[in-house]
């Protein structure tokens, strides 16, 4: 039995997969901040988690996916205010009793040290210093991401 949050996440991900393939993104669009091979958009308004998920989708992006601790730290360095929380693309899957990224993968327990409970209707937020489990209905800011396409150097044979 999927929760409404899980269903929303799956629906948006499926609609994303159905859309036609777009050309790779070489530079971050206006207003997006480049962080390594990603473009990030930090909201300055607040929303519950599922609305944040939908907002990123309308911008042809997704809620932030964090690969490892290193990426977390670099993202947190862009958050200047200690008191502000941002939704990312991770929520609790009741059916699998585990933290699940919106791309379908599960959280590697070593990646993030989450403060708070792992339970139904829990979603993950980050601050400048920590990672928190919050009720998904809580209205906080959010971070969208777009992946930059790596530019591969062409190798030409000697002429």
């Amino acid at each position: 039995q999927k929760s409404s949050i899980e269903k929303c996440s799956v629906d948006i991900q499926q609609s994303r997969n159905k859309t036609t393939e777009r050309p790779g993104l070489l530079n971050c669009p206006i207003y997006w901040q480049q962080l390594r091979e990603k473009c990030l958009l930090f909201s300055h308004t607040v929303n519950p988690w599922n609305n944040s998920l939908a907002d990123c989708s309308t911008k042809e992006s997704s809620l932030l996916l964090i690969r490892d601790k290193d990426e977390l730290i670099h993202t947190q360095n862009l958050i200047r205010d200690k008191a502000i929380l941002f939704w990312i693309g991770l929520n609790f899957s009741l059916s699998e009793k585990n933290w699940k990224w919106i791309n379908g993968s599960f959280l590697n327990s070593n990646d993030l040290e989450i403060r708070g409970d792992a339970k139904e209707n829990s979603c993950i937020s980050i601050s400048q210093t920590s990672v928190y489990s919050e009720y998904c209905s809580t209205e906080i800011r959010w971070i969208c991401q777009k992946e930059l396409t790596p530019v591969r150097n062409k190798v030409y044979p000697d002429s």
Epitope: I30, L41, S43, H44, T45, K59, R80
Partner: antibody, heavy 121, light 108 residues
């Protein structure tokens, strides 16, 4: 209520550098984009560029070689420097808050009252 | 860059009449990231509409925006004396941000 106030000299000599500062009061400088826009006498609006609280900038290519925008988050201020000015740079200069593309305050939603800068010897 | 062309340059109308202002873009504006501003003499511009059709805080409902792609419209349903001013469209979907040349709404 966020308010913006421009300050700086109203008269600059040709070939010198125009320097203006905008003070943000009543709110935080974080997570917004802080723009400079100018309006020559009797003409339309021209965007000069913006700075994000992190210090990343985006400039109008037509002015990029002469423009520097900086931010001081501790003072809630951001500044404009425009080098090698000519009479064509005479304008009202506005600082403004840009909400970007997120939420209930998209686009340039708060403006300073503007400051007249004349370039003349 | 996206060039915005506003028509007409001047609109002469009487209070109570309907004003229709046009803004045409040289290329498609992504996600309808188009705003409208009102400017009165000696004052800074004021945001009226963002996202092509969303009214900014405190803007009366006689102001409405519409359009998508390359063609956008600002409509003032019944002109009041305070509405006579210059109106600018602006796109914020790509860099550099650009403004239209403006439409002056004057009293007939």
């Amino acid at each position: 209520q966020v308010q913006l106030q421009e300050s700086g000299p109203g008269l600059v000599k040709p070939s010198e550098t125009l320097s203006l500062t905008c003070t943000v009061s009543g709110g935080s400088i974080s997570f917004y984009y802080w723009s400079w826009i100018r309006q020559p006498p009797g003409k339309g609006l021209e965007w000069i560029g913006y700075i994000y609280h992190s210090g990343s900038t985006n400039y109008n290519p037509s002015l990029k070689s002469r423009v520097t925008i900086s931010v001081d988050t501790s003072k809630n201020q951001f500044s404009l420097k425009l080098s090698s000015v000519t009479a064509a740079d005479t304008a009202v200069y506005y600082c403004a808050r840009d909400g970007g593309i997120v939420g209930v305050t998209e686009a340039i939603d708060i403006w300073g009252q503007g400051t007249v800068v004349t370039v003349s010897s | 860059e996206v060039v915005l062309t506003q028509t007409p340059g001047t609109l002469s109308l009487s209070p109570g009449e309907r004003a229709t202002l046009s803004c045409r873009a040289s290329q498609v504006i992504s996600s309808s990231y188009l705003a409208w501003y009102q400017q009165k003499p000696g004052q800074a511009p004021r945001l009226l509409i963002f996202g092509a059709s969303s009214r900014a805080t405190g803007i009366p409902d006689r102001f409405s925006g519409s359009g998508s792609g390359t063609d956008f419209t600002l409509t003032i349903s019944r002109l009041e004396p305070a509405d006579f001013a210059v109106y600018y469209c602006q796109q914020y979907g790509s860099s550099p941000l650009t403004f239209g040349g403006g439409t002056k709404v004057e009293i007939k």
